[in-house]
Interface confidence: low
């Protein structure tokens, strides 16, 4: 149940009033409005949309709405020199060229400023050479190639299929393998669900469709030229050679029609096993190079994109808190899109817009939240989470002292099967309790709670009786708040059935075919899933901003810490002899987790019993809850990743999208058997156990009685 108090409100102004005000029809209308033209970061169209949102949020009733601008490094194709890939014969003649653009969807033929498919931040270059097929270009795929198959990628152009991991990790892996160029493509095995037609007749990817995206390895840095500091008017900018995270080899994405032409000629080694085969009618030979008759032909890339410092605009709206105005609950999602943004991001932006409207309606009737709510429309998320990161860098001192929670609001849907939540363990109980109060939109669950349909369709893979809630990774705007600043964060959206749909993401992700019609015709005609996501995101914000005691349960952190400690210990125990040789012990970590569990349990007991009418004690207890997430931050950051500072969670070093637990220990243990100096490697494992144990113990002590 929501716990509200009188902040100049009438009794009806509770969570129910807020939720009842949310309307599917409004979300639909807002989505349509936001998707009629492209809103690429750094363009005039996206600046105009920022101003429109600013104006509408003011109309909705927020106390203030400001634009926050930054000048950051972005990347665009050269309008006069298009990017493409060719097959060249021994005379250097181009006998095949990939397409220069996606065929526009019906009704959009005359829209201007559709950016052609490109890999943002690719350097310029025209490498030519033999092709090597590297599957998904994951760490394990390169291990298979180099260690098992003895195939050397040095000096080769690699072709990798999209999916499984963040594209930036693919490029990094290819660089480390010595490749001189990367071709990324969407295989129907990953982006064409069986039994569904391709767009415009269904939600599948047509052969000419291509996924855009950045290929940076920023590791949380934000603008590549101003890591750690805002890209403001007086910023000192690094030279491009010192910029953070830029790829060093040309990269370009293609669709599966073009990929077919490259892959059908491949020779060399056969694929190592069936997991390397996609769904094209090609042999999926690894190479290097083309087969027999075509062995003299090469692949050539023509990449002419440019990196430019460009102005971006965030929209920041404020609804001042009545009791604790210096405590901030933030709801943020991005506004910039690759093209129309039918799903990414505007299905999320439309939901945020409706949430703002509902809060504004309550405010106009005399209500205020207990704590301040900040609403954000971020820019340049697609170019590396730049808008959110620069704003957080500019406001870091305020945020680390006042930030209660951050709720992310990118795409509201990636399917229409069930709910998907990633969040800090502090929010597990909030999410469980909220979803038990909301109605499920799912067919067959009429009259049942969202919690029931979610748990039924997406059970926890390890713990009975719970819906699956995943770890936060990255690849979205919560990154700086959670991984760098240690502000409790969460995200929620509707997703696909992962059991029956093995493709990666949704098929039309980052393509020109991600339109309003895609959503309205195929994903959510009644906008009931969008409404549910609005209720979850909005309900979380409402509770976080309005409940007298913060709705965080520190005991859930204790439970996962034990689970993560068990997991990392079991990974280490794959090397029992080395653990003995180098005296590696996890006792300190398990002891710290045990202490955390006991202290968290006692804190929770005190939380039930303390005098909530005493504002000093109430504030003290709430501050202990607010600062718990902060206590997991190591000011020195993770090795070689200074902006990933959370000791319990970080984006996986092998897949930015995925979260890893105890990442310092995990990375120290990863592939340790292949390290040249085992003594040094195991020494680093011991150091990371020490850092983790200390951090958990220190966090536990923040929950102890203060005196």
């Amino acid at each position: 149940k929501s716990s509200n108090e009188a902040t100049n409100i009438t009794p009806k102004h509770n969570m129910k009033a807020f939720l009842d005000e949310l309307k599917a029809e409004n979300i639909k209308k807002f989505l349509y409005n936001f998707t009629q033209i492209p809103h690429l970061a750094g363009t005039e169209q996206n600046f105009q949309l920022a101003k429109q949102i600013q104006s509408q949020w003011k109309e909705f009733g927020l106390d203030s709405v400001e634009l926050a601008h930054y000048d950051v490094l972005l990347s665009y194709p050269n309008k006069t020199h298009p990017n493409y890939i060719s097959i060249i014969n021994e005379d250097g003649n181009e006998i095949f060229n990939t397409s220069l653009f996606e065929p526009p969807p019906p009704g959009y033929e005359n829209v201007s400023d559709i950016v052609p498919p490109f890999s943002a931040f690719s350097p310029q270059g025209m490498p030519e050479g033999d092709l090597v097929y590297v599957n998904y270009a994951r760490t394990e795929d390169f291990f298979k190639l180099e260690r098992d198959m003895k195939i050397n990628c040095s000096g080769k152009i690699v072709i990798a299929r999209y999916g499984k991991v963040f594209r930036g990790n693919k490029v990094k892996n290819a660089q480390l393998a010595g490749a001189k160029g990367v071709i990324l493509y969407s295989d129907p095995a990953d982006y064409f669900a069986p039994g569904v037609k391709s767009y415009p007749d269904g939600w599948n990817l047509p052969g000419g469709g291509v996924q855009r995206g950045n290929i940076l390895n920023l590791n949380g840095a934000g603008d590549p030229l101003t890591p750690g500091y805002p890209a403001n008017e007086y910023a000192y900018r690094r030279g491009i050679a010192e910029a953070v995270g830029l790829p060093s080899i040309p990269v370009h994405p293609i669709g599966y029609y073009d990929a077919q032409k490259l892959l059908e000629k491949m020779g060399g080694s056969a694929p190592p096993d069936s997991s390397w085969r996609g769904s094209l009618k090609v042999p999926y030979n690894v190479g290097p190079g083309f087969t027999g008759n075509f062995s003299t032909q090469k692949v050539k890339m023509h990449i002419h994109s440019t990196n430019e410092v460009t102005r971006i605009y965030n929209v920041i709206g404020t609804l001042r808190g009545a009791v604790e105005p210096d405590r901030y609950v933030i709801l943020g999602g991005h506004r910039d899109s690759w093209v129309f943004g039918g799903i990414d991001p505007q299905s999320g932006a439309a939901v945020v817009h409706e949430i703002v409207r509902s809060f504004g309606t309550l405010k106009k009737e005399g209500w205020r939240p207990r704590r301040t709510i900040l609403f954000a429309s971020w820019d340049a998320e697609e170019f590396g989470l730049l808008g959110s990161t620069e704003w957080a860098e500019e406001n870091s001192r305020l945020l680390q002292e006042r930030g209660v929670a951050y709720i992310n609001a990118d795409s509201s849907i990636e399917g229409n099967y069930t709910l998907r939540v990633d969040c800090t363990p502090l929010m597990y109980s909030l999410v469980h309790n909220l979803t038990k109060e909301l109605k499920s939109p799912d067919e067959g669950f009429e009259g049942k709670s969202l919690y029931e349909s979610w748990t039924k369709k997406s059970p926890s893979p390890e713990f009975s009786g719970m819906p699956r809630i995943s770890k936060l990774g990255s690849g979205n705007d919560f990154e700086v708040f959670f991984q760098r600043l240690g502000i409790a964060s969460g995200r929620a959206r509707y997703t696909k059935n992962w059991e029956t749909n093995k493709f990666s993401g949704y098929p039309l992700y980052h393509s020109v075919y991600e339109t309003y019609e895609l959503v309205e015709k195929f994903y959510d005609p009644m906008f009931k899933y969008h409404l549910t996501v609005a209720q979850v995101r909005g309900g979380m914000v409402f509770e976080l901003a309005n409940s007298i005691v913060l709705p965080f349960d520190c005991r859930d952190y204790a439970v996962v810490l034990r689970k993560y400690a068990d997991k990392i210990y079991s990974i280490s125990m794959k090397h029992p002899q080395e653990m003995k040789t180098y005296s590696v012990s996890f006792d300190s970590l398990f002891s710290a987790v045990k202490n955390f569990t006991e202290i968290a349990s006692k804190f929770s007991e005190r939380l039930q019993d303390f005098d909530k009418s005493n504002p000093i004690v109430l504030r003290m207890m709430n501050d202990q809850l607010m600062f718990l997430e902060r206590a997991f931050i190591d000011p020195l950051g993770l090795p070689d990743r200074p902006f990933y500072r959370h000791v319990i969670y970080a984006p996986s070093s092998h897949n930015k999208y995925a979260g890893e637990s105890f990442p310092g220990i995990y990375d120290a243990l990863f592939d340790i058997e292949s390290k040249v100096d085992p003594s040094k490697a195991w020494g680093e494992v011991k150091r990371q156990i020490y850092v983790a144990a200390f951090t958990v113990q220190a966090a536990a002590e923040t929950l102890s009685e203060v005196a």
């Epitope: 059970p459 893979p461 390890e462 009975s464 059991e499 439970v559 068990d566 569990t597």
Partner: antibody, heavy 116, light 107 residues
Framework: EVKLVESGGGLVQPGGSLKLSCAAS????????MNWVRQASGKGLEWVAE??????????HYAESVKGRVIISRDDSKNTVYLQMNSLRTEDTAVYYC???????WGQGTTVTVSS | DIQMTQSPSSVSASVGDRVTITCKAS??????VSWYQQKPGTAPKMLIY???NRFTGVPSRFSGSGSATDFTLTINNLQPEDFATYYC?????????FGQGTKVEIK
């Protein structure tokens, strides 16, 4: 309807071996972790082993009492999970149940008797 | 290993009674506790998962509660078919462990 059918039990001498099978139907077998749980006559339940799904790299876990003597495996193409038991002892005598994920569905059990 | 201690080991009750069985974990197991019912000669059946959630098809007279180390299974309005042995079990960490069982007998 979820169905788990164990087979392969029987009488075996101490030190001998036995391979139990569990045929699954009614659910997407490859997505689920599988367990073996045993129960000696008139006694309580004892977890024996777990095998996770392909997405979890078929990770296996064993009870201390059987570690090094039993191997759990699975064949997703046959929707079957196995328990290979070696160096059997009299204290391994029990009904062996195959269960899905967190023991939410159980087979009818197969009896293993270790006796000379 | 985490010990799951059930009490009582047996209980005599009549049809219509309310029966309460407790399970104490030797360490915090969150809410990762399930309850099972077993009748002679048959396999156990899951009743409750996640400490308090009824499994599919389980009558509403069965309920579970608790978290961390103390858990309870309650059977309201005991029915003839409820006379059986009941086990708690934890799936929080390896090895998974069960309580020693509570036999509910006819008075």
């Amino acid at each position: 309807e979820v169905k788990l059918v164990e087979s392969g039990g029987g009488l075996v001498q101490p030190g001998g071996s036995l391979k139990l099978s569990c045929a699954a139907s009614g659910f997407t077998f490859s997505n689920y972790w599988m367990n073996w749980v045993r129960q000696a006559s008139g006694k309580g339940l004892e977890w024996v082993a777990e095998i996770r799904s392909q997405s979890n790299n078929f990770a296996t876990h064993y009870a201390e009492s059987v570690k090094g003597r039993v191997i759990i495996s699975r064949d997703d193409s046959k929707n079957t999970v196995y328990l290979q038991m070696n160096s059997l002892r009299t204290e391994d005598t029990a009904v062996y149940y195959c269960t899905r994920r967190w023991n939410n569905f159980w087979g009818q059990g197969t009896t293993v008797t270790v006796s000379s | 290993d985490i010990q799951m201690t059930q009490s009582p080991s047996s209980v005599s009750a009549s049809v219509g009674d309310r029966v309460t069985i407790t399970c104490k974990a030797s360490e915090n197991v969150g809410t990762y506790v399930s309850w099972y019912q077993q009748k002679p000669g048959t396999a156990p059946k899951m009743l409750i998962y996640g400490a308090s959630n009824r499994f599919t098809g389980v009558p509403s007279r069965f309920s579970g509660s608790g978290s961390a180390t103390d858990f309870t299974l309650t059977i309201n309005n005991l029915q003839p078919e409820d006379f059986a042995t009941y086990y708690c079990g934890q799936s929080y960490t390896f090895p998974y462990t069960f309580g020693q069982g509570t036999k509910v007998e006819i008075k």
